[in-house]
């Protein structure tokens, strides 16, 4: 099973290491999740040709997956620490329903999918401690999420495979943008 950050054998062997700062812990957590996503993408791409053909195979994508935009203040131009942090936390909270959908979507990487989901929950907690303006963070409505999950799971096999690919790709992009932004904070 994947080992969460801070619990690997190297850490056990080096008890006198300086404890990680909050920023270092967040950075490490995101990189850990990104490694997990890479493993899941590998299984998805090996199973079908979704990864190469998604552009040609789809005319329209209405999955409302979180995405960084200029107004979110996470890019170098117009960078705004507080606005950006709110966007990162809000986006991760919105991704949670899609990460729930990913459970049971993998055969050989089932534990990896669970690890990505649980590590994201931990990351959200880390980031919430860092945020000053928690009131600005909107939490997704559980009823809406439950309905969304039902609809996603009702799709046929091909659409579910495509949805899985799109979620992993978007989540990877979102985390990479978040990582770059958090390193500026």
């Amino acid at each position: 099973a994947p080992v969460p950050p801070g619990e690997d054998s190297k850490d056990v062997a080096a008890p006198h290491r300086q404890p990680l700062t909050s920023s270092e812990r967040i950075d490490k957590q995101i990189r850990y999740i990104l490694d997990g996503i890479s493993a899941l993408r590998k299984e998805t791409c090996n199973k079908s040709n979704m990864c190469e053909s998604s552009k040609e195979a789809l005319a329209e994508n209405n999955l409302n997956l979180p995405k960084m935009a200029e107004k979110d203040g996470c890019f170098q131009s117009g960078f705004n620490e507080e606005t950006c942090l709110v966007k990162i936390i809000t986006g991760l909270l919105e991704f949670e329903v899609y990460l729930e959908y990913l459970q049971n979507r993998f055969e050989s990487s089932e534990e990896q999918a669970r690890a990505v989901q649980m590590s994201t929950k931990v990351l959200i907690q880390f980031l919430q401690k860092k945020a000053k303006n928690l009131d600005a963070i909107t939490t997704p409505d559980p009823t809406t999420n439950a309905s969304l999950l039902t609809k996603l799971q009702a799709q046929n096999q091909w659409l579910q495979d495509m949805t899985t690919h799109l979620i992993l790709r978007s989540f990877k992009e979102f985390l990479q943008s978040s990582l770059r932004a958090l390193r500026q904070m």
Partner: nanobody, 125 residues
Framework: QVQLVESGGGLVQAGGSLRLSCASS????????MGWFRQTPGKEREFVST????????YYADSVKGRFTISRDNAKNTVYLQMNNLKPEDTAVYYC??????????????????WGQGTQVTVSS
């Protein structure tokens, strides 16, 4: 279970027009993405056109762009394919398809859940 019935096929001369219709028996027609595919003997079924739930966006294969127009009437549970300036290479059996996806608009057959029986279109030169 959704049932799809195509009509409007026939024999037409090159340069002529036809309008295909596809009627759906489903009560939730407006929640389906609708598409048209075609197949000629010995060849794989190919994508022709698809339209999203609301009818706001239609998409086309390059070979029919500018000549074919897809539309839908959710009140009548029907999708249409207006085919103008027909060419002999448009000769095929045309199939209507419905995708219950809810989020994605596919251009490939695997993305569709329900299929009609097909209607023959023959374009003579």
């Amino acid at each position: 279970q959704v049932q799809l019935v195509e009509s409007g096929g026939g024999l037409v001369q090159a340069g002529g027009s036809l309008r295909l219709s596809c009627a759906s028996s489903g009560r939730t027609f407006s929640s389906y993405v609708m598409g048209w595919f075609r197949q000629t003997p010995g060849k794989e079924r190919e994508f022709v056109s698809t339209i999203n739930w609301s009818g706001s966006n239609g998409y086309y294969a390059d070979s029919v762009k500018g000549r074919f127009t897809i539309s839908r009437d959710n009140a009548k549970n029907t999708v249409y394919l207006q085919m103008n300036n027909l060419k002999p290479e448009d000769t095929a059996v045309y199939y209507c398809a419905a995708s219950a996806g809810g989020f994605l608009v596919p251009r490939v057959g695997q993305g569709y859940d329900y299929w009609g029986q097909g209607t023959q279109v023959t374009v003579s030169s």
